[in-house]
Structures are given as C-alpha cells and as structure tokens.
Amino acid sequence: IGLLYPFPRDCSQAMLNGDTTSGLYTIYINGDKTQALEVYCDMTSDGGGWIVFLRRKNGREDFYRNWKAYAAGFGDRREEFWLGLDNLSKITAQGQYELRVDLQDHGESAYAVYDRFSVGDAKSRYKLKVEGYSGTAGDSMNYHNGRSFSTYDKDTDSAITNCALSYKGAFWYKNCHRVNLMGRYGDNNHSQGVNWFHWKGHEYSIQFAEMKLRPSNFRNLEGRRKRA
C-alpha cells in the first residue's frame, strides 16, 4: 500500500502516513526529494504532528552563538538543539503554520499556541510573524511580532544596546525581550535565563522549553485521515 505522502513536507504529513511515535523523521521541503531534512517530530502533544525546532532541557548545548549558527541550526535533535532559521523560513513558506510552545518547571507546565506563525527569508533577517494566542503561559510572544532575528554579531533590535550581547542569547528581540528561550540555561539573573515573562517572569530560568510548529489546518487533515 502506497503512502499518503511519499515525501512528507512536515511532521503532520508523516503522522498522516501512520507514524505516531515521537522521534526523528525525514521531511522534504515542498515535497521535493532533493530537499531532505531530519527533524524531531512530537506526535503526542495536542494531537501530534509537530516539528520541534527548539528544545532546552539541561544546559549542555551552548545557545550563545552567532548569526551563521542560528541560520544553519545546531545541536542534537534528540536533546538540546535549534533547527535553524533557514529551515524555519522554508518550512513556513510551504503554507499556513501554527506555533506551540511547551514549558515545564518542577512539575508545573504551561503552553502557548499561536495559530499564525511564520519566519521570513534571510533578506528580511528572518522576520517573525506570530498571531492568535491561546494557552496558559501568557501571551509573551506578542511583543516580538514583526521583529527580525538578532544575534550578538548581527544586531537588528530596536534597543540602544545589543540585546543578544546583553542577555547572552539570540531571539527576535525588540527592546529587549519578553521571551528569551535561547538565554543562558539556569541563570536566574534578571532577563539572562530561559525566560517566558508572563509565566515565570524575568528572574527565573525555566527548566524545559520546546517550540514546535505544524500546519494550521492539521485538525481538518487529521479528521480526513480518520474518516478514510
């Protein structure tokens, strides 16, 4: 029996192929077999089908990196990693995607979902679009909507200072942040750590964070698969 999606363009299509276990999968940008990308798929959270593009969990990976590293991606996709801005830009150019952020700390958990999420191309300096919040973590990403990505060696924020340099991370900084998920792991100094302002504030570094995306119409696709 042939697969529904021989060259799945994201984790939702992998899931619709019958793959329901979270782990590493190969996806193909635009369904093009020459554009293969290994990703970690979360097949359990809120119905699954998510491409995980950021994970913080133990501080073993260095996230204070330059523009080139954030464009390309780094880390171990089973552990701490960043998928890469070039990849995010290509994936979100395939259609309408939603963003989910999962946060955990000492047995507490919170999440945020944004039903419209995209990352622009390199020319736009990977401009962020994030709209339509729901969840329990608080709408901290709202502040970063419309911003370009910033690293210590490419300062695109609107602050006098270099936000990435000041807060030892990288993000779609404005002046400077309400979200700093690429901050210094375990650093509880003001604004330096893994922060989600409307959940734990700026003086507490969150233990576990994941950012992930899937098509906004995933629920419809999932329903179609079940009926089939």
Epitope: Y143, S158, A159, C176, R178
Partner: antibody, heavy 120, light 107 residues
Framework: QVQLVESGGGLVQPGRSLRLSCAAS????????MHWVRQAPGKGLEWVSG????????YYADSVKGRFTISRDNAKNSLYLQMNSLRAEDTALYYC?????????????WGQGTMVTVSS | DIQMTQSPSSLSASVGDRVTITCRAS??????LNWYQQKPGKAPKLLIY???NLETGVPSRFSGSGSGTDFTLTISSLQPEDFATYYC?????????FGQGTKVDIK
C-alpha cells in the same frame, strides 16, 4: 487619518454608573490593544485599563478592579469602559489610547479625552 | 507596582538651551520606557518609545537614552513649542505606570 474620539463623559453622583465609548478610525482596529488612561484635574497621567486586539485579555489598575469593565466591538471599531460604583476620586479626563504594537507598549495615538465628574 | 520617579519636577529654561530630564524606575525594566509631551488642554503625544526610538514626525532635537533603571530625555536646543509637561512611562509590566511629570517653562 488615524483618529480616536471619546464620548460618554458627564456629571454623575457617587455610586452611580457611566459608560464611556471610543470610536476608532484610520487603522486596522482589531490588530491593536487599546487602553484607557485618566488624568485628574491638575494631576499626572494614570493608566486605568487595557484590552488585547481580540478582546481575549483584559487588564486593570488596582484602583478600578471590580468596578470598571473594559470591552471592545471590533466590528464597530469601538472601545468601551463601563464604570460602576463611581467615587469622587474617579473624577478625571479619560483618554482612549492605542497601543503601539503589543499589549504592554507605548501609546502612539490618543483621543482628545472625555471628562467624568463624580459629585453629589 | 513599578514606581517611576522623574526629576526635576519642574525647570525653567530659555530658547536654545539644552534640557535634560531623568526618569528612574523602582526595578529593572530593560528598555521598556517611553516619553510623552503634553501641552495644556491637549492629549499627551508620544515622543520616544523603547527608551531611544524617535516616534515618526518628532523633531530630531529630542533624544532618549538609558537602560535598566535609569533613563534620560534630552532636548538639544529648546524651541518655543517645546514648553510643556513631559512624562515617562514604563511598559515593562502591567500596570503600566507614569512618572509624575516634569514641567518645562520659560525662564
């Protein structure tokens, strides 16, 4: 052009209610959080309440919590402030203001204000 | 709540003077600081947002600086239309709070 016009102010007795309105034009109303800021005669500015673009999140100053309710009708490009159990200290010029980008942000557009006087 | 303290509360200056107004936050607020100008009988007008960004249409003689807890609004060469009251505001957290204002009048 971008404009905010407040209405609904007036003289009201303590303990009574009043509803302020703010009509917006010249921008995509539901893309922006909106706020009410007041200024007592001869005094400084005090933030009163705010609401997200969708209306899903609302925020209040402690001084008005439980008495005032902010709401919006995006179909009508309108913002409202329902003020109950009014007190003399609520006497002020009430301004409607647009958030620059996010819910907690600078206020880049202000209305001309509507005066609320609470007195017996 | 975050307290915002402006100084001075009033100042007298002449046309052409360089004027500096400071604003101090009671806690660290990164760069979430805005400045407004208000003339008698008028609504406030945004001058500077995010500590240092000049709002569109505002003359370049106005500038803002600072980060963390201490911020400054500078008017490089005071003009007749600049005599007004100036307010700082933190937008770091709710409730957003304003300074008590600085009145700039003619010497």
């Amino acid at each position: 052009q971008v404009q905010l016009v407040e209405s609904g102010g007036g003289l009201v007795q303590p303990g009574r209610s009043l509803r302020l309105s703010c009509a917006a034009s010249g921008f995509t109303f539901d893309d922006y959080a909106m706020h009410w800021v007041r200024q007592a005669p001869g005094k400084g500015l005090e933030w009163v309440s705010g609401i997200s673009g969708s209306g899903g999140s609302t925020y209040y100053a402690d001084s008005v919590k439980g008495r005032f309710t902010i709401s919006r009708d995006n179909a009508k490009n309108s913002l409202y402030l329902q003020m109950n159990s009014l007190r003399a200290e609520d006497t002020a010029l009430y301004y409607c203001a647009k958030s620059y980008q996010s819910d907690e942000d600078a206020f880049d557009i202000w209305g001309q204000g509507t005066m609320v006087t609470v007195s017996s | 709540d975050i307290q915002m303290t402006q100084s001075p509360s009033s100042l007298s200056a002449s046309v052409g003077d360089r004027v500096t107004i400071t604003c101090r936050a009671s806690q660290y607020i990164q760069g979430f600081l805005n400045w407004y100008q208000q003339k008698p009988g008028k609504a406030p007008k945004l001058l500077i947002y995010d500590a240092s960004n000049l709002e569109t249409g505002v003359p370049s003689r106005f500038s803002g600086s600072g980060s963390g807890t201490d911020f400054t609004l500078t008017i490089s060469s005071l003009q007749p239309e600049d005599f007004a009251t100036y307010y700082c505001q933190q937008s770091y957290s709710t409730p957003q709070t304003f300074g008590q204002g600085t009145k700039v009048d003619i010497k």
